[in-house]
Interface confidence: low
Amino acid sequence: GITIPRNPGCPNSEDKNFPRTVMVNLNIHNRNTNTNPKRSSDYYNRSTSPWNLHRNEDPERYPSVIWEAKCRHLGCINADGNVDYHMNSVPIQQEILVLRREPPHCPNSFRLEKILVSVGCTCVTPIVHHVA
Amino acid sequence: GITIPRNPGCPNSEDKNFPRTVMVNLNIHNRNTNTNPKRSSDYYNRSTSPWNLHRNEDPERYPSVIWEAKCRHLGCINADGNVDYHMNSVPIQQEILVLRREPPHCPNSFRLEKILVSVGCTCVTPIVHHVA
């Protein structure tokens, strides 16, 4: 891979746990300013695999509140507005990074943690197992 | 709100930027060990709003590789396997936290950054604007 020269203005890395322990500025930079603000506000309701959003709160985590999608139906909504059980509503899941306070209750010490969240639902054709 | 007592074993917070700058252990704890590894591996293909996954790589970001979903069609796949343009395939987007090297190329100094990623696609009923 490409070796990027180290910036001479980098903070000191004398910490015995380096490079596992790093300094992180929590002043979040948001790269989403130019995105379309209408992007997905009501998809949860208009989808053929609609979902509800549930609040998951944990003060020992950063961010402390995450919203989890739960599919409303096992099947998908058809053109008549009825649930079609020949199709399946399934959650689209993604692994995200969060910060976990470690040791617990510490205001300035965290550990990176990967958690799996359901972001929304999609309608899929079921896998049918034919018995010989 | 509830005040959680500070753990006496917390690291020192004398840093002048505290509490904006915190210590983070990059030794990731993965809470997803019991999840089904097949959980959504083929939904991108079986969905009525199928998508392709594109690799987005940035060595100055942690994680450096993120996969972005792009819907294959404007419409959705109907029961006959054809694209139905009376429905819309739309990306389900989510904001995620990443770490951005700051100053650039520093191995041990990061800033939290929020980026918007498309995780998958869902099929929605279009919003029809009726003209009087």
């Epitope: 603000p37 992007r39 997905s40 506000s41 961010p63 995450i66 972001v119 | 389900i92 989510q94 929020k114």
Partner: nanobody
């Protein structure tokens, strides 16, 4: 950091009224559409009402149309929800939310205010 603080919830009898307020700080309030969102006990999240940046357009979920009115005061960075003819099914925690973002991170949401409609 973005902060949204809701107030005005409480216990009210069916047919009664409440006015919810949301004090916003940490962002340019007048640049964002704002929502009132609710979560009934054991239920999913429901968008209740939305108001555009300048207050010119307002949207409501069918179940509250004609009973609830969303408004804003950009000079005071405040969002309001006037709730009239309250019903038992309006019982929920009400949150104000910034923008039309897929909700994930806490800085777009307040802690909520509980509205209980009961006789």
């Amino acid at each position: 950091q973005v902060q949204l603080v809701e107030s005005g919830g409480g216990l009210v009898q069916p047919g009664g009224s409440l006015r919810l307020s949301c004090a916003a700080s940490g962002f340019t309030f007048s640049s964002y559409g704002m929502y009132w969102v609710r979560q009934a006990p054991g239920k999913g999240l429901e968008w209740v009402a939305k108001i555009e940046q300048d207050g010119s357009e307002k949207y409501y979920v069918d179940s509250v149309k004609g009973r609830f009115t969303i408004s804003r005061d950009n000079a005071k960075n405040s969002l309001f929800l006037q709730m009239n003819s309250l019903r038992a099914e309006d019982t929920a925690v009400y949150y104000c939310a910034k923008g039309e973002i897929l909700p994930l991170y806490f800085d777009y949401w307040g802690q909520g205010t509980l509205v209980t409609v009961s006789s």
